[in-house]
């Protein structure tokens, strides 16, 4: 199983295919969106190991930054994620794909910076309310992934300055109507809901009125539930190892998972000369699993000290979450100490610690 076959789209972000090498793709994402950059191998051939770089610095994978050989995902993007991204061949540092990414304010209704659209003296003596930025109110249907922040705005003016109130599905909408509460920013004519959930779906209406009249606008919100997936394991890890008797070995496993992953290291063993159990599945013993004072980071590394010939064999990194499992295996070959020099000369693949 490789990352290529395991990787699933997180949320509902559109995947952006990579530009031709040398071209720079200009991309704009909304705050809170999932930024997805894809860089398929040129001509569809093998690409070899790659690295993703932002503003000249290699990207470090994290819960929010998911790095694969041909795809980069940055979840819950913010202004700080704006910049120049490139996918490069690890060995040659040749740029395979180049993107210019800009993350703008809230994805919902094309906001400007806070502070704009505040109530202003328009110079009109008296008058009914009117929209000051109707072009910003075109997007009446909003579909956003769960956990994102949504902001609806109805920038208006009038004299006297109108008031604004909000309805959900035709009824008065107040903070206590949702678990996360709401933020009403009257000066910015906005309603903000953080970390939306499916129960936030519905029609939201702003009502702007003064003594000379009333205007209203209705937005429809759809909350897209994440389609959860089993963990993703970085391709090529753990890697096969050859070690000299008595040396130390480390196997590495990189796990990406939306849901809390559970990581185990297993060793394939024989029982009474058989490698498989009565039901035909391979016998394994658990070498490392979540336990007292073991962090997820520590679980991504299996350390074997002072290896013996009994340590040779197949090792499996197994990662599971509530949806399913993924696993990658690697082999350890243990060589006798006296072969160390010969093997090192011939292959350069012997690790003596």
């Amino acid at each position: 199983e490789s990352l290529g076959t395991e990787q699933r789209v997180v949320g509902r972000a559109a995947e952006v295919p990579g530009p031709e090498p040398g071209q720079q793709e200009q991309l704009v994402f909304g705050s809170g969106d999932a930024v997805e950059l894809s860089c398929p191998p040129p001509g569809g051939g093998p690409m070899g190991p790659t690295v993703w770089v932002k503003d000249g610095t290699g990207l470090v994978p994290s819960e929010r930054v998911l790095v694969g050989p041909q795809r980069l995902q940055v979840l819950n993007a913010s202004h700080e994620d704006s910049g120049a991204y490139s996918c490069r061949q690890r060995l040659t540092q040749r740029v395979l794909c180049h993107f210019s990414v800009r993350v703008t304010d809230a994805p919902s209704s094309g906001d400007d910076e806070d502070g704009e659209d505040e109530a202003e003296d328009t110079g009109v003596d008296t008058g009914a309310p009117y929209w000051t930025r109707p072009e910003r109110m075109d997007k009446k249907l909003l579909a956003v992934p769960a956990a994102n922040t949504v902001r609806f705005r109805c920038p208006a003016a009038g004299n006297p300055t109108p008031s604004i109130s909000w309805l959900k599905n035709g009824r008065e909408f107040r903070g206590e109507h949702r678990i996360g509460g709401i933020k009403l920013r009257h000066q910015q004519w906005s309603l903000v809901m953080e970390s939306v959930v499916p129960s936030d779906r519905g029609n939201y209406t702003c009502v702007v009125e003064n003594k000379f009249g009333s205007i209203r606008q209705t937005y429809t919100l759809d909350v897209l539930e994440r389609s959860p997936h089993r963990p993703i394991l970085q391709a090529g890890l753990p890697a096969n190892q050859t070690a000299v008797l008595g040396s130390d070995v480390e196997f590495h496993c990189k796990v990406y998972s939306d849901a809390q992953p559970h990581i185990q290291w297993l060793k394939h063993v024989e029982v009474n000369g058989s490698k498989v159990g009565p039901d035909g599945t391979p016998y394994v013993t658990v070498l490392k699993t979540a336990g007292a004072n073991t962090t997820d980071k520590e679980l991504e590394v299996l350390s074997l000290h002072n290896v013996t010939f009994e340590d040779a064999g197949e090792y499996t990194c197994l990662a599971g979450n509530s949806i399913g499992f993924s696993h990658h295996s690697a082999w350890l070959v243990v060589l006798p100490a006296e072969e160390e020099l010969v093997e090192a000369d011939e292959a350069g693949s012997v690790y003596a610690g």
């Epitope: 599945t281 391979p282 336990g291 197994l318 599971g320 399913g324």
Partner: antibody, heavy 127, light 108 residues
Framework: QVQLVQSGAEVKKPGASVKVSCKAS????????MHWVRQAPGQGLEWMGW????????NYAQKFQGRVTMTRDTSISTAYMELSSLRSEDTAVYYC????????????????????WGQGTLVTVSS | DIVLTQSPATLSLSPGERATLSCRAS???????LAWYQQKPGQAPRLLIY???SRATGVPARFSGSGSGTDFTLTISSLEPEDFATYYC?????????FGQGTKVEIK
């Protein structure tokens, strides 16, 4: 949503058999071992055994050997536990419970804590 | 079989108090293979702690587990009304899987 839904309550006569079902949803049924645990009224929890839904392999607690049969139907993501030769002391709530064991391996040691449980099925054995 | 003995059998406390529940094994258990469950009347058990000290998904931070070898502890730092229930420890170090007899935490 990951869940296990069990069949309804049963009343059986001593000597009879009972078959309890456990339907899984929201995850890949064949990937996780399924265990069965029972709880007599006012008592603690007692492990009965497991089934590997992928291979059909089973492992029963010594106490239930010969009386219990665990099976599965992968086409409908359902596990079954049948207990025969019922006696009054088998009156209990029977739970199916999913574990973090990957069904493509045969584990020689522990790690089977139960992260998802069915709601339980009350089996009453009475003459 | 590994026998798990929980103490006390019943713990009478008030909301806001600290609860300390003990689980003692008849032989050594790897901390990776000890778990704690919460059960309320008429409900299935719910996984709280696995690997002796790792909180299961969605379990509040007031629950913590510790211990190694033969002595393990579940601590509830400040009892909430919904925490009054019966708690079971479980070992999966050796077959068969065994549970403690339970500690009932009741409102004083």
């Amino acid at each position: 949503q990951v869940q296990l839904v069990q069949s309804g309550a049963e009343v059986k006569k001593p000597g009879a058999s009972v078959k309890v079902s456990c339907k899984a949803s929201g995850y890949t049924f064949t990937s996780y071992y399924m265990h069965w645990v029972r709880q007599a009224p006012g008592q603690g929890l007692e492990w009965m055994g497991w089934i590997n839904p992928n291979s059909g392999g089973t492992n029963y607690a010594q106490k239930f050997q010969g009386r219990v049969t665990m099976t599965r139907d992968t086409s409908i993501s359902t596990a079954y536990m049948e207990l025969s030769s019922l006696r009054s002391e088998d009156t209990a709530v029977y739970y199916c419970a999913r574990t973090w064991q990957y069904s493509y391996f045969y584990y020689l040691d522990g790690g089977y804590y139960f992260d998802i449980w069915g709601q339980g099925t009350l089996v009453t054995v009475s003459s | 079989d590994i026998v798990l003995t929980q103490s006390p059998a019943t713990l009478s406390l008030s909301p806001g108090e600290r609860a300390t529940l003990s689980c003692r094994a008849s032989q050594s258990v790897s901390s990776s293979y000890l778990a704690w469950y919460q059960q309320k009347p008429g409900q299935a058990p719910r996984l709280l702690i696995y690997g002796a000290s790792s909180r299961a998904t969605g379990v509040p931070a007031r629950f913590s587990g510790s211990g190694s070898g033969t002595d393990f502890t579940l601590t509830i730092s400040s009892l909430e009304p919904e925490d009054f229930a019966t708690y079971y420890c479980q070992q999966t170090n050796n077959a068969p899987v065994t549970f403690g007899q339970g500690t009932k935490v009741e409102i004083k």
